[in-house]
C-alpha cells in the first residue's frame, strides 16, 4: 500500500559536511513501528546510506558506525547526515515503511538534492 512521503527538494550541507532535512509521511493508519531508510541516487545507481527502525515514543537509533542520526516527532523524522564531502553530492531519498501494526505501508519521497562543497584549505601562515 502506497503512502505519501514529503522531503525538501534541496539542502546545502554545512562547511563541516553536515546536512539535515525533514522527512514527513502521511500515515494512513495508526503507525507504532516505523522503518526509515535513506537512499542515495547518483548516476542512476541507488545505494543505502543508513536505516533505522523505531517504535513510537522511542528514540530513533541508527547503527553505531552510521553517518546518520535522527529524531522523530509524530509523523516527522528529522534526519542528519554527517561526514559529507563534495563527492557525496547527490539525491538523497527518504523511504518510510510502516512496519506495525498491519497493514504494511511503504512510501518513498522524491528525494532531497544535497549539495556538498569542500571547504577551501586554509593558506599556510608564516
Amino acid at each position: 500500500k502506497a503512502m505519501h512521503v514529503a522531503q525538501p527538494a534541496v539542502v546545502l550541507a554545512s562547511s563541516r559536511g553536515i546536512a539535515s532535512f525533514v522527512c514527513e509521511y502521511a500515515s494512513p493508519g495508526k503507525a507504532t513501528e516505523v522503518r526509515v531508510t535513506v537512499l542515495r541516487q547518483a548516476d542512476s545507481q541507488v545505494t543505502e546510506v543508513c536505516a533505522a527502525t523505531y517504535m513510537m515514543g522511542n528514540e530513533l537509533t541508527f547503527l553505531d558506525d552510521s553517518i546518520c542520526t535522527g529524531t522523530s516527532s509524530g509523523n516527522q523524522v528529522n534526519l542528519t547526515i554527517q561526514g559529507l564531502r563534495a563527492m557525496d553530492t547527490g539525491l538523497y531519498i527518504c523511504k518510510v515503511e510502516l512496519m506495525y501494526p498491519p497493514p504494511y505501508y511503504l512510501g518513498i519521497g522524491n528525494g532531497t538534492q544535497i549539495y556538498v562543497i569542500d571547504p577551501e584549505p586554509c593558506p599556510d601562515s608564516d
Partner: antibody, heavy 120, light 112 residues
Framework: QVQLVQSGAEVKKPGASVKVSCKAS????????INWVRQAPGQGLEWMGD????????NSNQKFEGRVTMTRDTSISTAYMELSRLRSDDTAVYYC?????????????WGQGTLVTVSS | DIVMTQSPLSLPVTPGEPASISCRSS???????????LYWYLQKPGQSPQLLIY???NLASGVPDRFSSSGSGTDFTLKISRVEAEDVGVYYC?????????FGGGTKLEIK
C-alpha cells in the same frame, strides 16, 4: 532469559471487571510490543489487542466493543489487560505474548496464561 | 476479518512417519512487498503456544528442521518429515497481514 510471568487465576461474577498483569524480564521492556490473546476452554486462539510499552499506544480487536483496556507500567516492566462487563463466554485463559520484529512481528515468547472464570 | 481455516481437525500419526497440515486464508497473505504474513504456532498439552514458523517458511530459533512450511497466497501447508512423540499438540496457523490478527481453528496432532 526472556520471561513473561502472569498474575494468578481469577473468579469473577458477570458484569464485573478483571485485570490481568504480565511482568516481563530478561529483555528491555520498552523494545517490544506486548499482545494479548485468549483461549476459551477447548477452543482456539483469539487476538485481543496490543500495546506499545513506550507510549502506551494500543490497538484492539473491535469484537471487544471497547471492553478491553491495555496499560503498562514501565517502571516495573509490567503490562496489564483489563476486561470489563464480563460475561460467561469470557471464561478463558488469557495470555500475554511478546512481539519480535526480527520474526516480522510474530509472538516469540508467551506468558504461562491466566485462567479467568466468569460465573454467577 | 481474515478467516483462517485449517484441516484436518485431528491428525493421528505413527512416530517416524510424515505429517501434513493445511491452512487456507480468506484473503491472500502475500503482500506486494514480497512477504507472506503467515505464521505457525504449536501448543503442546498444558502449555502456552510457541512459535514455529514466521513469514510462511522461516523456522523460528530452536525449531527442528524436520518442520517446514510452504504455500501460495491463500493455501499453506505445514509438514513434519518424521513425527516424534514431542510433536504432539495443537497446531495453529495465523495471519498478521491486517488487524485483527486471526488464527486458524487448530489441528490436533496425536500419536497413533
Amino acid at each position: 532469559q526472556v520471561q513473561l510471568v502472569q498474575s494468578g487465576a481469577e473468579v469473577k461474577k458477570p458484569g464485573a471487571s478483571v485485570k490481568v498483569s504480565c511482568k516481563a524480564s530478561g529483555y528491555k521492556f520498552t523494545d517490544h510490543f506486548i499482545n494479548w490473546v485468549r483461549q476459551a476452554p477447548g477452543q482456539g486462539l483469539e487476538w485481543m489487542g496490543d500495546i506499545n510499552p513506550n507510549n502506551g499506544g494500543t490497538n484492539s480487536n473491535q469484537k471487544f466493543e471497547g471492553r478491553v483496556t491495555m496499560t503498562r507500567d514501565t517502571s516495573i516492566s509490567t503490562a496489564y489487560m483489563e476486561l470489563s462487563r464480563l460475561r460467561s463466554d469470557d471464561t478463558a485463559v488469557y495470555y500475554c505474548a511478546r512481539l519480535r520484529r526480527e520474526y516480522f512481528y510474530a509472538m516469540d515468547y508467551w506468558g504461562q496464561g491466566t485462567l479467568v472464570t466468569v460465573s454467577s | 476479518d481474515i478467516v483462517m481455516t485449517q484441516s484436518p481437525l485431528s491428525l493421528p500419526v505413527t512416530p517416524g512417519e510424515p505429517a501434513s497440515i493445511s491452512c487456507r486464508s480468506s484473503k491472500s497473505l502475500l503482500h506486494s512487498n514480497g512477504i507472506t504474513y503467515l505464521y505457525w504456532y504449536l501448543q503442546k498439552p498444558g502449555q502456552s503456544p510457541q512459535l514455529l514458523i514466521y513469514q510462511m517458511s522461516n523456522l523460528a530459533s530452536g525449531v527442528p528442521d524436520r518442520f517446514s512450511s510452504s504455500g501460495s497466497g491463500t493455501d499453506f501447508t505445514l509438514k513434519i518429515s518424521r513425527v516424534e512423540a514431542e510433536d504432539v499438540g495443537v497446531y495453529y496457523c495465523a495471519q498478521n497481514l491486517e488487524l485483527p490478527l486471526t488464527f486458524g481453528g487448530g489441528t490436533k496432532l496425536e500419536i497413533k
